[in-house]
């Protein structure tokens, strides 16, 4: 596969004010329940050593983890935002299903593994933190994949 095969999202995904608002409101609701403000999941350490052209693939990994291991277990919380945001993020995940990179993805896997381990170590509060950073996930997908 050539580098960054199909690692692309249409800008129109991010031009729907309603779902943008719902995603950010969900993040706000969860962040109000997050009392561990020193830890940042989607921040400088996640992108360290990863070139911009590979960051869409990185964010695909984070998106899939967030959907499967965070939003699914917490799906009954933070309504009505959750029931609207999950299908939207699932659609983005489906659009990135063919996103792969060729070459060394060691840094990406290491950074994603660190994020996953942090969430797991924090338990339910880690899941709440990840939901509280959905605004960052959204912006990072927009920045990296459009």
């Amino acid at each position: 596969l050539p580098v960054n095969t199909r690692c692309k999202l249409e800008v129109s995904n991010f031009q729907q004010p309603y779902i943008v608002n719902r995603t950010f409101m969900l993040a706000k609701e969860a962040s109000l329940a997050d009392n561990n403000t020193d830890v940042r999941l989607i921040g400088e350490k996640l992108f360290r050593g990863v070139s911009a052209k590979d960051q869409c693939y990185l964010m695909k990994q984070v998106l899939n983890f967030t959907l499967e291991d965070v939003l699914l277990p917490q799906s009954d919380r933070f309504q009505p935002y959750m029931q609207e945001v999950v299908p939207f993020l699932t659609k983005l995940s489906n659009q990135l299903s063919s996103c792969h990179i060729s070459g060394d993805d060691q840094n990406i896997q290491k950074n994603v593994r660190r994020l996953k381990e942090t969430v797991k170590k924090l338990g339910e509060s880690g899941e709440i933190k990840a939901i509280g950073e959905l605004d960052l996930l959204f912006m990072s997908l927009r920045n990296a994949c459009v």
Epitope: V11, D38, R48, Q55, D135, N143, A144
Partner: antibody, heavy 121, light 111 residues
Framework: EVQLVESGGGVVRPGGSLRLSCAAS????????MNWVRQAPGKGLEWVSG????????DYAASVKGRFTISRDNAKNSLYLQMNSLRAEDTALYYC??????????????WGRGTLVTVSS | QAVLTQPSSVSGSPGQSITISCTGA?????????VSWYQQHPGKTPKLIIY???KRPSGVSNRFSGSKSGNTASLTISGLQAEDESDYYC??????????FGGGTKVTVLG
């Protein structure tokens, strides 16, 4: 060492146009989102426009939308701001600014020294 | 255009702690994790001192700290020093993907 050098400022009449440039060096230019921020004499900072690493997303302040266009040429390590239909209130020092870390252009960690734009009849 | 509100001036004596607030509507500071703070000395370019709400760039003194509660972000300067006399600006990404700056706060070190 990260360096950002703006150019293209000058005096222009209301309704006129200018094209600002920002030459970047000391880092991998296409790994970072970039911004233009302005500061009118004696006033505060005002974000003007931002662009992601590949030019796929371009965002503007409401005050310049439809008049200004941001662009970048990664092969030339350069950022641009095309300013049309200029008004007196666009008079300011225009800074080029880079995101502090790759992946977050909104944290502006590196700034140029600015280029002065004066709109006057 | 969204607006972030800062006090126009804050003063303190050397060694004291001061806090600068930055208040926005729920669509600004309150909704997002994107708050940053900048220091600008007269005639100089702005300098990033806090990003991602509470993170400090390398080389920035640990006397500067950031926090956020509800719709208000805060910058605290502890052990105030003469060289801290400067203008300080908060900024945040907002829901139309633009960045909004606060109006700025002039910090004066007394005595």
């Amino acid at each position: 060492e990260v360096q950002l050098v703006e150019s293209g400022g000058g005096v222009v009449r209301p309704g006129g146009s200018l094209r600002l440039s920002c030459a970047a060096s000391g880092f991998t230019f296409d790994d970072y989102g970039m911004n233009w921020v302005r500061q009118a004499p004696g006033k505060g900072l005002e974000w003007v426009s931002g662009v992601n690493w590949n030019g796929g997303t371009r965002d503007y302040a409401a005050s310049v939308k439809g008049r200004f266009t941001i662009s970048r040429d990664n092969a030339k390590n350069s950022l641009y701001l095309q300013m049309n239909s200029l008004r007196a209130e666009d008079t300011a020092l225009y800074y080029c600014a880079r995101g502090w870390y790759s992946g977050a252009a909104w944290n502006m960690g590196y700034w140029g020294r600015g280029t002065l734009v004066t709109v006057s009849s | 255009q969204a607006v972030l509100t800062q006090p126009s001036s804050v003063s303190g004596s050397p060694g004291q702690s001061i806090t600068i607030s930055c208040t926005g509507a729920s669509g600004d500071v309150g909704a997002y994790n994107f708050v940053s703070w900048y220091q600008q000395h007269p005639g100089k370019t702005p300098k990033l001192i806090i990003y991602d709400v509470n993170k400090r760039p390398s080389g920035v003194s640990n006397r500067f700290s950031g926090s956020k509660s509800g719709n208000t972000a805060s910058l605290t300067i502890s052990g105030l020093q003469a060289e801290d006399e400067s203008d300080y600006y908060c900024a945040s990404l907002v829901s139309d993907f633009s960045v909004v700056f606060g109006g700025g706060t002039k910090v004066t070190v007394l005595g």
